[in-house]
Interface confidence: low
């Protein structure tokens, strides 16, 4: 909120836009303001908190020759590899005299193919000995439905049917491969293929 002798008009003439994309995306948010006199430092907020280590650049252009003339200030925040922790509401913040001004918000969202948090691992088992395999994936978007495959053959009729995060295998009599498909509204991601080697009896 403003903190000065009066609630002056906001200096922001350009507010951050919105970015929605998949993990790893690179994007830039931009704020523009017009101020009289010495240009202020532009801070970036995510969900109301100042970003201490923001990858931001600031450029300022005088609109006249006098120090007290107006300046155009542009701050750009670079998001180099979009992660879930980057999502939220972004705003620019400046201190002018004894006042604090915050821009209108822009939003960064994450939406793409499922991302694996856990994938099935290779292992060696004795013949006909039970074991478990794990697979875990997340969006957004949610929900994420899993489909297990054994030797490239689906173990359920559809994603979300049958085992999900943990697959119980009652036993094998020959070396087999297992993988996991993660399905969401954006598409399908396939996990690594785990080779389960069966020791001869």
């Amino acid at each position: 909120a403003p903190r000065g002798t009066q609630a002056e008009e906001s200096p922001f003439v350009g507010n951050p836009g919105n970015i929605t994309g998949a993990r790893g995306l690179t994007g830039t948010l931009r704020c523009q303001l017009q101020v009289q006199g010495e240009p202020p430092e532009v801070h970036w907020l995510r969900d109301g908190q100042i970003l201490e280590l923001a990858d931001s650049t600031q450029t300022q252009v005088p609109l006249g020759e006098d120090e007290q003339d107006d300046w155009i200030v542009v701050s750009q925040l670079r998001i180099t590899s979009l992660q879930l922790s980057d999502t939220g509401q972004y705003q620019c913040l400046v201190f002018l005299g004894h006042q604090t001004f915050v821009s209108q918000p822009g939003y960064v969202g994450l939406e793409g193919l499922p991302y694996f948090l856990e994938e099935p691992e290779d292992r060696t088992v004795a013949a006909n000995t039970p074991f478990n395999l794990s697979c875990q994936a997340q969006g957004p978007p949610e929900p994420v439905d899993l489909l297990w495959l054994q030797d490239a053959v689906p173990l359920a009729t559809a994603p979300g049917h049958g085992p999900q995060r943990s697959l119980h295998v009652p036993g094998l009599n020959k070396t087999s491969s297992f993988s996991c498909e993660a399905h969401n509204a954006k598409g399908v991601t396939t996990s690594r293929t785990a080779t389960i080697t069966v020791l001869p009896q």
Epitope: A1, R3, Q6, E9, F95
Partner: antibody
Framework: QVQLQQPGAELVKPGASVKLSCKAS????????INWVKQRPGQGLEWIGN????????NYNEKFKSKATLTVDKSSTTAYIQFSSLTSEDSAVYYC???????????WGQGTTLTVSS | DIVMSQSPSSLAVSAGEKVTMSCKSS????????????LAWYQQKPGQSPKLLIY???TRQSGVPDRFTGSGSGTDFTLTISSVQAEDLAVYYC????????FGGGTKLEIK
């Protein structure tokens, strides 16, 4: 996490001066205004003034301009309020509070109880 | 200076009842450019520091129960507690930050 630490109590004699502290931690001290608020026993809240640590810019409630002085020490991330010519009217709880930017949590110290008594 | 007036100064209600309290400012707290109203509501429980409930007149602070609602525009504002709980025993203050800070005198809420 953000913390504003204030001494629990101070006892001073009438006519003396006192300097109360507010030690900030868990955030960039220079980026947020620190406000000071007075509360007399059983009474409401009164805003004294504020200070922006980066530049030491201050604003004061006219009522407290000749009574209180706000300062900061950036190296120790501590804000101070100094009172002069103390009287019993200055006996109160004094809170320091970090400014908020829409949607961020507000943080208050626990308050220092100042007692002015001979 | 902006003067903030609160009413009533105290009220007693039974748990589960709806309660409203009023805050009036001596001038408009609306910034026409940012379209924000610089009016906040605080709750102060006995022996504790004040806690922010509502900012920008009607935006609930994160973690505040949704039984607390702020409303109003210009110079007249209201804090409503839709169903008072025993833990809501406190003094409630409005505060303007349009021009520095000024607090209202407070409304003491007691539970019957």
């Amino acid at each position: 996490q953000v913390q504003l630490q204030q001494p629990g109590a101070e006892l001073v004699k009438p006519g003396a001066s006192v300097k109360l502290s507010c030690k900030a931690s868990g955030y960039t001290f220079t980026s947020y205004w620190i406000n000071w608020v007075k509360q007399r026993p059983g009474q409401g809240l009164e805003w004294i003034g504020n200070i922006y640590p980066d530049s030491s810019s201050t604003n004061y409630n006219e009522k407290f301009k000749s009574k209180a002085t706000l300062t900061v020490d950036k190296s120790s991330t501590t804000a101070y309020i100094q009172f002069s010519s103390l009287t019993s009217e200055d006996s109160a709880v004094y809170y320091c509070t970090r400014d908020t930017y829409g949607g961020s949590p507000d943080y208050w110290g626990q308050g220092t109880t100042l007692t002015v008594s001979s | 200076d902006i003067v903030m007036s609160q009413s009533p100064s105290s009220l007693a209600v039974s748990a589960g009842e709806k309660v409203t309290m009023s805050c009036k400012s001596s001038q408009s707290l609306l910034n026409s450019r940012t379209r924000k109203i610089y009016l906040a509501w605080y709750q102060q429980k006995p022996g504790q520091s004040p806690k922010l409930l509502i900012y920008w007149a009607s935006t609930r602070q994160s973690g505040v129960p949704d039984r607390f609602t702020g409303s109003g525009s210009g110079t007249d504002f209201t804090l409503t507690i839709s169903s008072v709980q025993a833990e809501d025993l406190a003094v409630y203050y409005c505060k303007q930050s349009y021009n520095l800070w000024t607090f209202g005198g407070g409304t003491k809420l007691e539970i019957k």
